[in-house]
């Protein structure tokens, strides 16, 4: 049994880091493998992650972490029984994938304005709470070409757009994702999408 593709890990910079790797053949990850991880920290102890299958030869492990700070460094040991298959390290602050925003809501009761709001996925005491920026994706269910991205570079988790920038009388969907420039993170996954019917009063034409 050998590792074909070494583990790569990303951290949500809160409580979970996810490591993925590939074996050289079909593997029952949960029965055959164990990933041991230990904070490089005086008197810390190793924790064991039981991996799950992620395709025939792929494995994934969710490492539980008690908070994350920038200095954290973990040693990783991948074991098959008594055989050490791979040894490495992982610094969560250098491999951050933020959590996806939640509770995306479209408020259509504001006069001719769409107000989109969502929740910051981090608690106020987490470093990323004040460092997230967002991308909002809005698209038409009827017209695949009607697809737009709004970059929200301020901290408030909201976006206002004129309803008239979208077509009236059709349904739209929106979703939002996050990233943090401070840690050069990857983008989060998209939030679940929300749907609304766009309608607004066309302005009277002046003749």
């Amino acid at each position: 049994m050998k590792v074909l593709q070494e583990p790569t890990c990303v951290s949500d910079y809160m409580s979970i880091s996810t490591c993925e790797w590939k074996m050289n053949g079909p593997t029952n990850c949960s029965t055959e493998l164990r990933l041991l991880y230990q904070l490089v920290f005086l008197l810390s102890e190793a924790h064991t992650c039981i991996p799950e299958n992620n395709g025939g030869a792929g494995c994934v492990c969710h490492l539980l972490m008690d908070d994350v700070v920038s200095a954290d460094n973990y040693t990783l040991d991948l074991w098959a029984g008594q055989q050490l298959l791979w040894k490495g390290s992982f610094k969560p602050s250098e491999h951050v994938k933020p959590r996806a925003p939640g509770n995306l809501t479209v408020h259509t009761n504001v006069s001719d304005t769409l107000l989109l709001t969502w929740s910051n996925p981090y608690p106020p005491d987490n470093y990323l709470y004040n460092h997230l920026t967002y991308a909002v994706n809005i698209w038409s269910e009827n017209d695949p070409a009607d697809f737009r991205i709004y970059n929200v570079t301020y901290l408030e988790p909201s976006l206002r757009i004129a309803a008239s920038t979208l077509k009236s009388g059709i349904s739209y969907r929106a979703r939002v994702r996050a990233w943090a420039q401070c840690y050069n993170t990857t983008w989060s996954e998209w939030s679940p999408s929300t749907k609304w019917h766009n309608s607004y009063r066309e302005p009277f034409e002046q003749h």
């Epitope: 920290f41 005086l42 008197l43 700070v69 200095a71």
Partner: antibody, heavy 120, light 108 residues
């Protein structure tokens, strides 16, 4: 209420031994690494020793290595420091301290301290 | 072994002023953790800051920590009468724990 209560301090002659105890209440000792820190009269804080939550690993400052032994009894929620070959420079207030991994070495709960005096 | 000199040894200020206390590690500490403690006469130390910049539970927001590498700072934005005490920095690493010698913050 989360508390640490040290006991076992006293006056001992150079070369003698003492065993300090620390009783924890208000939390489960087995979830935390535990440490001893001392403070000589009028001086600063000095790290002495620590033990991981399951006793799998221990650590000693160079100044006490080979003379002090740290141990714990998790079911009894108690931490110990066995001190032998005591010297005058071991005279200090000894604090029992809890470290939360979440606090990354920050010692968030301290006992009130027990005084050890080494003198002839 | 890492040494943690603190400066100044004594700092004389008045209530309402800003206090800046320094802690300088003798070598870089990228995978270690810096904490700050406050100690008043006859009392055990109290944790103020951990992980260089995070306030411990119940610590007022006038206390803040910053720094990286070898230079670390504890700032008290506006001194209250109860803030006059001795302050210690502490480095908790992968192989050792070290305390600074302390800075005494006294009323001017």
């Amino acid at each position: 209420e989360v508390q640490l209560l040290e006991s076992g301090g006293g006056l001992v002659q150079p070369g003698g031994s003492l065993r300090l105890s620390c009783a924890a209440s208000g939390f489960t000792l087995s979830s935390y690494a535990m440490h001893w820190v001392r403070q000589a009269p009028g001086k600063g804080l000095e790290y002495v020793s620590g033990i991981s939550y399951s006793s799998a690993s221990t650590y000693y400052a160079n100044s006490v290595k080979g003379r002090f032994t740290i141990s714990r009894d998790n079911p009894k929620n108690t931490l110990f420091l066995q001190m032998s070959s005591l010297r005058a420079e071991d005279t200090a207030v000894y604090y029992c301290v809890r470290v939360k991994v979440r606090y990354r070495g920050g010692m968030d709960v301290w006992g009130q301290g027990t005084t050890v005096t080494v003198s002839s | 072994e890492i040494v943690l000199p603190q400066s100044p040894g004594t700092l004389s200020l008045s209530p309402g002023e800003r206090a800046t206390l320094s802690c300088r590690a003798s070598q870089g500490v990228s995978s270690a953790y810096l904490a700050w403690y406050q100690q008043k006469p006859g009392q055990a130390p109290r944790l103020l800051i951990y992980g260089t910049s995070r306030r411990a539970t119940g610590i007022p927001d006038r206390f803040s920590g910053s720094g990286s590498g070898t230079d670390f700072t504890l700032t008290i934005s506006r001194l209250e009468p109860e803030d006059f005490a001795v302050y210690y920095c502490q480095l908790y690493g992968s192989t050792s724990v070290t305390f600074g010698q302390g800075t005494k913050l006294e009323i001017k």
